[in-house]
Structures are given as C-alpha cells and as structure tokens.
C-alpha cells in the first residue's frame, strides 16, 4: 500500500533550491532500487519533479495560490524488472499554502454619489466595496477594514461595511456643493503590516428648497401707452433664489393694489422673470398711475424648512400710463336698426354716437363707408350721426343691409373709428299673391256640372313665411254668366268647377277665366291671374283626344295659291289699318287705361278679337307701349287675342332690333302647336322706333300647312294619339 500524508506547499517560495514537497513511498519498496516511481497529473514533470528511485517530490517554480490553490497528481510504483505496477495507481493532492501577498482592491477607482443638502447626520451616501484575493479561510490576509483618509468631518465610513454616511449637520449646498472623500481598505483586519488600497468618492450635495425668492429691489417703475392692447408686456421683474431647478422656480402674482384687475403678471419659464402685461384697456383720461404689489413665491415648498420663514417676497410696481391720441369711440360695438320697407326717402332710421376719448374731446364727424353701401341707399348726418334712407327699400330684394359708419376726428382726420350697422328691412304687405304656376287646363265637351277641372295654388313674396291666408274668386266682370265657378277651398287653394253640363268646342274652343287672388293681410293685396281652359273632345274615360275645332283644322278646300292670296289681302288690310291708326293717334273707343283706383287689382287683360278681320282694332302704339296695366270692360272667358304660350318668353332688350324681335316671335308662333288657326293679333309691349306695318297675323305666319312638322304629336302619349294619327299622314305637297 501507499504510504504518505497530504502534501502542503507554501506559495511564493523565494529560495535558491527547489522547494521540497514530500515523498511517495510504497511498503513494497525494499530499498534495493527494484521499484520505479512515476508522477503524472497537474504540473507533473514541469512544476513538480520526482526522484524515481526515492519517490521525493520537488517544486521547480514559485507557485501562486491565488492562481491555483490545489494541484491533483497521480502516483505509480512499477517493478523495474517486470514493468508491472506493484501498487494500484493512486491520486494525491498538493495544497498551496496562502501568504498575505494581495492588497484589497476597490470595485471602482472612483465613486460618484449624491446626498441632499441639510441632510441629517448619518444619512446614507454610498457603499464602497474592496475585495482581497488572499485566502479568506486562513488567517486575516483577506479580512478588510475601511477607514476615511480624506473627507472629515463631513463624512464617515463604517469600517466593516464600507457605508459612507454624512457626519456633519446643516451641510449647505449654497456654501459648498462638491466633496472629495478618500477611503482606505486594509487587510489583516487593519493591523500593522496589513496591505491596503484606496478609492476616491466624489460626493455632490443636491439642492433642497431651503432658500426663499428675494427681490433685489423693493420698487419697480414702468411706463406704457394707453393704447397698449391687452396682452402687451410692460416690463420685467426678477426675484432671485439661491436654490436651483424646481426649487428656484418662481410664481409671480399681483396680490394687491389699485390696478390688480387692469394688469397681469406671468412667469417666463426660461428666465424665471415676471412679465407684467396689460389685462384691460387702459385709459389715460380715467387713471394715469397704478401701484401694484407683486409677490414672488416658490411653488414647490418643503414643509420641513417652513421654520426658516415664508418662501415668498413682494415688491411694489408703479405703472405710469402715457397719453395717446385715440380715435373716436362709438357708444356700442355694433348697431342694429330697423326700417320698414315702405319708408320714404330721407326717413330717419336711427343714429350712432361716437366721441373722442381724449381729454381734448375733439369734435367728431360721421360718414358711411361707401364700399359697404355701393348703391348709396343710406346716408348719415355728418354732425349728429342720424342715419336716413336715400333710396327706396325693398325687403323682398334684400332683407338685411350691413353697412359701416366711420367716425373721424375733425381736427385730426387720421384718427377714425368704424362701427358695423345692421339694418333690418321690415316687411310691408306690398306684394300681391299670384299663381304658383301658369295654369292651362282642359274641359271635356261632355263634362258634367260641378266637375273639378283644375286646382289652383298661389304664392306671395311677403311675410309670413309660416303661411298666408289667400282667397280666390272670379273677377267681377267674369263672375256673372260665367261658364265656370271658383271654389275657394279655404286652405290657400281653389278649384275651378264646371258650371253647366256640356261644352261645344265649335262654339267656343277656349275660355279665359280671370281669377282674383287676394291675401288677408294689411293692406290687402290682390292680383288677377288668367286660367286658360280649352274645350276638348275626350274618350269615355275623360282622356283628352282633340282640342281644335275640326272645321278650322282641315283647310281641305284651299290650295297653296289661294292661301297666299288671302294672306296678301290680309297684309294689305293690316298695313292700311295700322297706318290709319298711326295718323289718327286718337281713338273714339273707350280708353285702354283703367282708372287709377283699379290698378291695384293687377288684372291681366285680354282683348276679344276673334271672329274675323272686320272687327280688328287698330292699336295706338303709344297705348301699347304704356307700361300701366289696362283692362277692357268686356267678357273675359272668351277666345284670346293670342293663345297663351306655355311659358312667357323674356322681352327684348331696348337695343335689340325690332325686326329681329318680331321675327323671333313669329318663329315661335310658326312652330307653336297651340297657335290658333284663325287670325288673331299678337300684341307685344315693345314695338321699337320704326314702322309698325308688319302684320302679325297668324294666317300670314304660316305660309302652308307644310311648314308645320306634326311629328312631335306622337311623342305626347296616348291622349294625343288621335291628333297624331290625323296629322301624321298629311302631305302638304299634295295640297293643290
């Protein structure tokens, strides 16, 4: 068996010889050199060598425990003759013995730490740590003790933990902010001969709010013109605070004084200055000097320092208002006036008032900004500000007039002010109700009495928008003996009813019903609208089939030549009659102009001209051009002079050539499917300045039936199928 103890070896051996480690020995060794010792494992043959005869082990180099504390090797004993092991291979350990060859090393060369100023004694600052590579399990080589080399009396260090604490009361950042503390770590428990290391700890005192703001002066004075608009900065004040950061933030406020409602103070966050601004419009004439008490305070207060006194300070601010020449001031920011639309020119609507706010009280003159009243509808008395109309108003054209009035100092025209005037035009019942649309209807020849053939609706441009109260009735001259009646439905509509059984389109193909529409407003307004009723042949369902008298529709006996001859005669006759009328200029018949009192009815008049040429009236051009309404006192529900076009076309402008104008009308009559087949005079208000000899005869206007294209009748649907069939096959070329 092997015979040895555990081997120990001191580190860092400095002798000149190899360091003896120990001896391997087997009890089989008789000392005759028959056994051979072999070493293998950690460092064998290099760090450790063995005498193969004796088994003595030596270390060839200086060893460092901190590098490797234990070496594990294997030993063998072999019979030299046979080469066989005499012992089983065995593992053994060489343990390196520690010596104090390492000083403590801090984890950081330099530590940085902060602690609030004014902290209590013993306040934790930072913990430093040093480590020692020596064996902590053997002796005191690795037992570290901390001590302070620099930084007293401000700080202390706990010897065993390395915790640095404050050691002095009331350390004031405002006096000294930075401290450099040197800490030593020493092994061997700090005893003599121990190794040591040091570190630097840079400690910064952080700020606490232990200082109030302070104004450097007790009084400030600023000047501002009275014209300064709200928000204008007047001046800056600054309180100083020894603290930093949010502890040095200052809030400024006006706490007292005669102008605390006239001024504001705001804090400039960048500079911590108080900016005094204008809050309300100043008036030199009312007050020239303001004295304010401004306070500066810290918004972030630490209650534990309140014993030091209030964390605020105040100063007096004197503000002097400088006089400025001001423009006139109106008594109101805007004026709302009302005027009835029937107001005469020069009617006073109301007035505006402005005065110079300066002490001088310069006189003021008024004017209307013509850019806001281009049509010069209003005027103003330059002296007293009275607004009056200079033109007639119409609410239905413009309900609100928004104009601007200017007030100017007479002595200093550069000083002027403007004010808006909102003038509401109040409604007067000056518009008559009228038909909502053009009414043209038909009645069947076989209609029964009291049959509804058309419902009428009316509109009125006047107020109220919420509703009107219209009434409908036949015009007086048509009421007696009329073939139709009007039924007022009392709901702003009316119905046209038949008054008899049966109508004959050969006797009368068209009736004109003058319907009077009135409102029940004040003053009552009315107009007369005409409803055209055609007598038509209808099927048994009441669907219209034909609305022309057949005898007039089919000119079967007339050739083209005969028609031309007739037309020529008519033209000559018309020229003669019109010339005769132009020469006479006076008519013995009843006047066309109605009496003034009847103009209010606005009755649209139609002259009965049917039946032939012998009763054609020669119209005085002066009368025709007269713009006033007129009425012929005759039956109203008969054939018109010119049957109504479905839509009224606009009249020609004054500079349009009258021939073009009439030609345009002729073309319309030529292509009008409702144009009467008999001769009728189509009158137009505009007759130009030249001759009126041209005939407007409907017979002349169509030279032959071939001029008419009846193709459109087939597009009119089933009611007009019969008409389309009748006219569709006509060929005027065969008409000889």
């Amino acid at each position: 068996s092997w015979m040895w103890n555990q081997f120990f070896l001191l580190e860092e051996y400095t002798g000149s010889d190899y360091q003896y480690v120990g001896k391997l020995h087997s009890d089989q060794d008789r000392g005759d050199g028959s056994l051979k010792y072999i070493l293998s494992g950690d460092g064998a043959g290099d760090l450790f060598i063995i005498n193969e005869n004796t088994g003595d082990i030596q270390a060839t180099k200086r060893l460092d425990r901190e590098e490797k504390p234990v070496y594990i090797l294997r030993a063998q004993a072999i019979n030299r003759r046979t080469g066989r092991p005499v012992e089983p291979e065995s593992e053994f350990i060489i343990k390196i013995h520690d010596i104090n060859d390492n000083e403590p090393i801090f984890t950081k060369d330099v530590y940085t730490a902060t602690v609030p100023e004014m902290a209590d004694v013993g306040t934790f600052v930072v913990q430093v740590t040093a480590t020692d590579a020596d064996d902590p399990t053997y002796g005191n080589s690795a037992k570290v003790v901390y001590s302070i080399l620099q930084g007293q009396p401000y700080f202390s260090v706990e010897s065993e933990t390395g915790i640095i604490k404050t050691a002095l009361l009331n350390m004031d950042r405002e006096n000294r902010e930075q401290y450099q503390v040197v800490i030593q770590a020493k092994d061997m428990g700090g005893q003599m001969g121990g190794l040591s290391g040091t570190t630097t700890v840079n400690i910064t005192l952080t700020d606490v709010n232990d200082n109030p703001p302070r104004f450097p002066q007790s009084t400030y004075q600023f000047k501002t013109p009275e014209s300064s608009p709200p928000g204008t900065p007047i001046g800056r004040i600054k309180a100083s605070d020894a603290d930093v950061g949010e502890n040095a933030e200052i809030e400024y406020s006006i706490t007292d004084g005669e102008g605390h409602d006239m001024f504001d103070v705001i804090t400039d966050q960048e500079t911590q200055e108080g900016i005094i601004t204008v809050k309300k419009l100043l008036d030199f004439e009312k007050k020239r000097v303001y004295t304010l008490k401004v306070e500066a305070s810290n918004p972030h207060i630490e209650p534990r320092f309140l014993y030091l006194g209030p964390f605020k300070d105040s100063a007096t601010v004197r503000i002097v208002v400088d006089d400025v020449d001001e423009p006139p001031v109106f008594s109101k920011p805007a004026y709302i006036l009302q005027i009835r639309e029937d107001a005469q020119i020069n009617t006073t609507i109301g007035s505006v008032a402005a005065q110079d706010p300066d002490a001088a009280r310069n006189p003021v003159k008024y004017s209307v900004d013509r850019h806001t009243d281009m049509d010069r509808i209003f005027n103003i008395d330059s002296g007293n500000g009275s607004i009056f109309t200079s033109k007639l108003l119409d609410r239905e054209t413009l309900l609100w007039h928004n104009i601007t009035v200017i007030a100017t100092e007479i002595n200093n025209p550069k000083q002027s002010s403007r004010v808006p005037l909102y003038i509401k035009v109040l409604d007067v019942n000056d518009n008559a109700p009228e038909f909502a649309e053009f009414y043209e209807t038909f009645v069947c020849e076989k209609a029964k009495a009291d049959q509804l053939i058309q419902t009428l609706h009316a509109v009125d441009k006047d107020d109220p928008y919420s509703g009107h109260q219209f009434s409908f009735s036949l015009a007086p001259e048509a009421a007696s003996g009329s073939n139709f009646t009007i039924q007022d439905n009392k709901d702003n509509t009316a119905g046209i009813l038949t008054r008899k059984n049966g109508y004959n389109r050969h006797e009368m193909s068209t009736y004109l019903l003058p319907v009077v529409i009135s409102d029940n407003d004040y003053p009552v307004q009315s107009s007369t609208g005409t409803v055209t009723v055609r007598v038509c042949a209808c099927d048994h369902h009441g669907n219209m089939q034909s609305c022309h008298a057949e005898a007039l529709i089919h000119p079967t006996g007339l050739s083209t030549g005969a028609l031309v001859a007739i037309l020529l005669c008519i033209v000559i006759l018309l020229v003669t009659v019109v010339l005769f009328a132009a020469l006479r200029r006076q008519r013995k018949k009843e006047p066309l102009i109605i009496s003034k009192e009847d103009i209010r009815d606005n009755i649209v008049s139609y002259n009965d001209e049917g039946g032939g040429e012998e009763d054609t009236q020669a119209f005085d051009i002066g009368t025709l051009r007269n713009p006033k309404p007129w009425r012929q006192q005759s039956r109203r529900d008969m054939v018109p002079e010119a049957l109504f076009l479905p839509r009224r076309t606009p009249t020609a402008r004054d500079n349009t050539d009258v021939r073009d104008f009439i030609s345009q009308r002729l073309r319309k009559m030529n292509t009008d499917p409702t144009a009467p087949p008999y001769d009728s005079l189509a009158t137009y208000a505009y007759e130009g300045t030249g001759s009126v000899a041209d005939s407007l005869s409907s017979l002349e206007s169509v030279t032959t039936d071939g001029d008419q294209d009846y193709g459109y009748l087939s597009d009119w649907g089933p009611r007009f199928k019969k008409l389309a069939d009748m006219y569709g096959g006509m060929d005027s070329d065969k008409d000889s």
């Epitope: 409604d427 919420s466 009735s473 009135s518």
Partner: antibody, heavy 116, light 107 residues
Framework: QVQLLESGGGLVQPGGSLRLSCAAS????????MSWVRQAPGKGLEWVSV????????YYADSVKGRFTISRDNSKNTLYLQMNSLRAEDTAVYYC?????????WGQGTLVTVSS | DIQMTQSPSSLSASVGDRVTITCRAS??????LNWYQQKPGKAPKLLIY???TLQSGVPSRFSGSGSGTDFTLTISSLQPEDFATYYC?????????FGQGTKVEIK
Amino acid sequence: QVQLLESGGGLVQPGGSLRLSCAASGFTFSSYAMSWVRQAPGKGLEWVSVIRSSGSSTYYADSVKGRFTISRDNSKNTLYLQMNSLRAEDTAVYYCARGGGYFDYWGQGTLVTVSS
Amino acid sequence: DIQMTQSPSSLSASVGDRVTITCRASQSISLWLNWYQQKPGKAPKLLIYAASTLQSGVPSRFSGSGSGTDFTLTISSLQPEDFATYYCQQYYTSPYTFGQGTKVEIK
C-alpha cells in the same frame, strides 16, 4: 277650433290708460294679421288698428293714431292694445279679430268705459 | 275715407221671404267688400268676403254679388236664426270702413 278671448277692459277716467289683451288658440297665430274693431254702445262697427303677422308693421284709424299702440307676442299667441290718453268717445266694446282685410273670427269683446 | 251706405237701415220680413240688402260705396272698391251678421250682445260673424265668396260654415241661402260701387247681400229664404243686424265693410283702401248696418226684424 279657433278661439279669441279678450281681457283688460274696465272703467277708466279720461286721460287714463288701459291695456287690452287677446289670447288666441286653435290656429297658427304667427301666420295671421290681427285687428282690433270697436263698437260704441248702440252704434255700428269701427275699425281701430291692425298688426301684421310678424309684428313688423302696424296701422291705425285716424281717431286713435298717436294714442293707441297695437302689439303682439307670437311666442305667447297674444295680441295687445295699449290705450293711452283715453277719451269719452273711446267708450266701446273692443273686439279682436283675425285677419287684415276680412275678419273671419272674432272674440266675444271686452267693454271699455271712459268716464269721470 | 270711403263711405259705405246700406239700405234699408231696417226691414221687416217673414220666415221664408227672400231678403235683399244693398251696400253702396262712395267710390269704386272693385270686389273688396265683406258682409257680417251680428246678433245682440254677440260678436259679428263673417258671412261673405270678396263680394261673393261664401265663408265656410255659412249656409248657402246667403249670397253676395256686385262689384265697383254697388253690392247686394241676398238671403234666399229667411230663417228664424237670420234675424239680426247686417253690416257691409270695404277693405279696398285704408281706413277700412263699415256700413251703418241693416236690422232685419220679424214682421
């Protein structure tokens, strides 16, 4: 149904004032012109005043012009007649009536007596 | 002002009679004439407006005609409830004026 109800009549001394009211119901008050018509005891009817639907225009008989003021409150459906500087000849039953030209509905009337 | 004159100022008639009351204007008023009926202690009631248009709810025995200056109210067959005073009124021009009234009494 349409109803008009006058109130405010009574005995007043010459030179005094009175305010008549007419409460309307059963129709869209704001769409109609409204009138006051009076009838002296044992006498015929006399038109007094009219106000348009919006209240924008008012008109008076010459006999009351400058003394009487017609007004209306469309939100309350009420017509008013403020009568100042009353005279003995103003003694009458005062009717409020709907319409500006023909009066299709009338109130029952309120008696105004001007006497010392 | 336009004067309105009614005739007769009073008349006596029996139930079933045809009664005619006329109203004349001092100038032409076109068709702007109304007829009212008033019973003692009651408010007037509109019968006819615009000379000939019957107010809704008014019996068809009442009819009106005329234009210009002469107008007529006709009761085709007098009924017991028709005994009252009848007024005409023009609304052609301001001020609106009433006739002096026609009292229809039982014969």
